[in-house]
Amino acid sequence: YNNFRKSMDSIGKKQYQVQHGSCSYTFLLPEMDNCRSSSSPYVSNAVQRDAPLEYDDSVQRLQVLENIMENNTQWLMKLENYIQDNMKKEMVEIQQNAVQNQTAVMIEIGTNLLNQTAEQTRKLTDVEAQVLNQTTRLELQLLEHSLSTNKLEKQILDQTSEINKLQDKNSFLEKKVLAMEDKHIIQLQSIKEEKDQLQVLVSKQNSIIEELEKKIVTATVNNSVLQKQQHDLMETVNNLLTMMSTSNSAKDPTVAKEEQISFRDCAEVFKSGHTTNGIYTLTFPNSTEEIKAYCDMEAGGGGWTIIQRREDGSVDFQRTWKEYKVGFGNPSGEYWLGNEFVSQLTNQQRYVLKIHLKDWEGNEAYSLYEHFYLSSEELNYRIHLKGLTGTAGKISSISQPGNDFSTKDGDNDKCICKCSQMLTGGWWFDACGPSNLNGMYYPQRQNTNKFNGIKWYYWKGSGYSLKATTMMIRPADF
């Protein structure tokens, strides 16, 4: 009876012992220590790490497994050769000894060994499959690791550059704030000085007012005397006229009517013989509507209708559309004549536009446009200019082609922002453009680095706010 027993030896190799009668056959098989048994589970979702150590371990383990597999394969081949050799020898002996029982036993043992060999081969195939699976998994993990590492590196780089940018911005802003603080202190000092000057002025004016009040009282008394004298004179004149009309009625039956003369512009006023600077009443074209304007009868041959004047900051130019339409301010001081009147006037005949400018250093310059007109209100009083000459820049500081007029409540500019609200005043803003003569009035020493001041870029640059400006028009054929 065959006794088949499996045990372990002292060095951990597996022993396969076959007892058959008085003969005992022992086979020593090597144990594959580095192979994971099929019963021990492989955890695929272990925490991924970027540490390169794990990767090196895996590579080493794989190399060990490959070596073991190679050894096993070689061992199997040796075992097969050994069995075949032994079988041959045994067969020869059996044949020689003619022991048939032993032959049967050997065949049985051979069969068992072959079966065991097949079992080992199957196990090795399983191990090989597991190793392949593990290798694939490890490769995927490695790929994931490298991808996430790249991503993290990119993020770190981005963040670092962002931090650097922010730091640069921060230091720039800090410098700006400090500069602004310095400016603020200087401005405060100048404001204090101005306040003191104003207080002196106010006290002076108060004393002047008192004197004037006294003079007014005297003048009022004189005025009543003069009124009486005028009344007496009028009576005398009326009596004389009555007498004259009575004596002349037979000779001339026609009665002369007082002719009401109306002027469209200052050129007409000039041509009628009024050659003195001053305020004159003008009439809208084809209408009885009237408007008061200042006429410059001296500059460049006279006959100029002043449509805008800035000189002292006494008038607020941050006005509504309707105010720019009808005009505002005082014609003898700072004022805007009115877009509607200028539009109607400049569409009747050809006009030239002269813009006269003064800076705070005593310099003067001008820009002359040989053709100027404004579109109607429906077209937002768009400005049209042609033929620039003059000393206030070779390039027009009023953007070409002309833009629509914009005010704080009528945003018709080409900017997503609202230029009029930002830069103050109504103007033919582009986006926002190189000029604005209706900006904030800044006094001397506060007139630089002002984005919302009285600007004429191609003469004084962007941040310079002018001291005085005059816009005047006159017929081209004057």
Epitope: K322, V326, E340, K408, D409, G410
Partner: antibody, heavy 119, light 108 residues
Framework: QVQLQQSGAELARPGASVKLSCKAS????????INWAKQRTGQGLEWIGE????????YYNEKFKGKATLTADKSSSTAYMQLSSLTSEDSAVYFC????????????WGQSTTLTVSS | ENVLTQSPAIMAASLGQKVTMTCSAS???????LHWYQQKSGASPKPLIH???NLASGVPARFSGSGSGTSYSLTISSVEAEDDATYYC?????????FGAGTKLELK
């Protein structure tokens, strides 16, 4: 379509304050001025003031300075008029009306709010 | 402020009659900023004529406006029953806006 919806009638005690509202719809609220007018029984219209919601600029009739305060909430397209230190003289019908910056005539009016000041 | 004086304060008219009411300003007004409104009893005012002579939308052609400077007028060429209302002129020539006291048109 353009609509100006005014808040309902108000009854207030003398010395108190009241806030009337005018909710605009059917147009861009910030592009038009909102004006307020007062009309006492059997009397004419009196202009109180206006607000331009686009910038928050306000203009008042001198007579109503200190009495009326105009505000506007762009998010809800609503204009408000607060009347303070109420007296019987403030009992009246109040209208809100709008105009565009070019037209300058009141093309749409609210349905009115009646304010009664009584102890 | 620019005071607007409307006359007459009250006027009576028969159906089909032509009526004219006036609005006089204490200082000159731009024709662009003189407007007329109609207010019926218990209702809100309604725009009638804007910019001196332009009819508001939905206003019948029997209404017309004219004028310039300080003198403006509103004319109804042929009065109809639905014209029974108070008519206000309104101006802007610088703040404040002002309204006239109104002309009440009654039908005989």
């Amino acid at each position: 379509q353009v609509q100006l919806q005014q808040s309902g009638a108000e009854l207030a005690r003398p010395g108190a304050s009241v806030k009337l509202s005018c909710k605009a719809s059917g147009y861009t609220f910030t592009d038009y001025y909102i004006n307020w007018a007062k009309q006492r029984t059997g009397q004419g219209l009196e202009w109180i003031g206006e607000i331009y919601p686009g910038s928050g600029d306000t203009y008042y009739n001198e007579k109503f300075k200190g009495k009326a305060t105009l505000t506007a909430d762009k998010s809800s397209s609503t204009a408000y008029m607060q009347l303070s230190s109420l007296t019987s003289e403030d009992s009246a019908v109040y209208f809100c009306a709008r105009y565009g910056y070019k037209g300058v005539y009141f093309d749409y009016w609210g349905q009115s709010t009646t304010l009664t000041v009584s102890s | 402020e620019n005071v607007l004086t409307q006359s007459p304060a009250i006027m009576a008219a028969s159906l089909g009659q032509k009526v004219t009411m006036t609005c006089s300003a204490s200082s000159s007004v731009s024709s662009s900023y003189l407007h007329w409104y109609q207010q019926k009893s218990g209702a809100s005012p309604k725009p009638l004529i804007h910019r001196t002579s332009n009819l508001a939308s939905g206003v019948p052609a029997r209404f017309s406006g004219s004028g310039s400077g300080t003198s403006y007028s509103l004319t109804i060429s042929s009065v109809e029953a639905e014209d029974d209302a108070t008519y206000y002129c309104q101006q802007w020539s610088g703040y404040p806006f002002t309204f006239g006291a109104g002309t009440k048109l009654e039908l005989k």
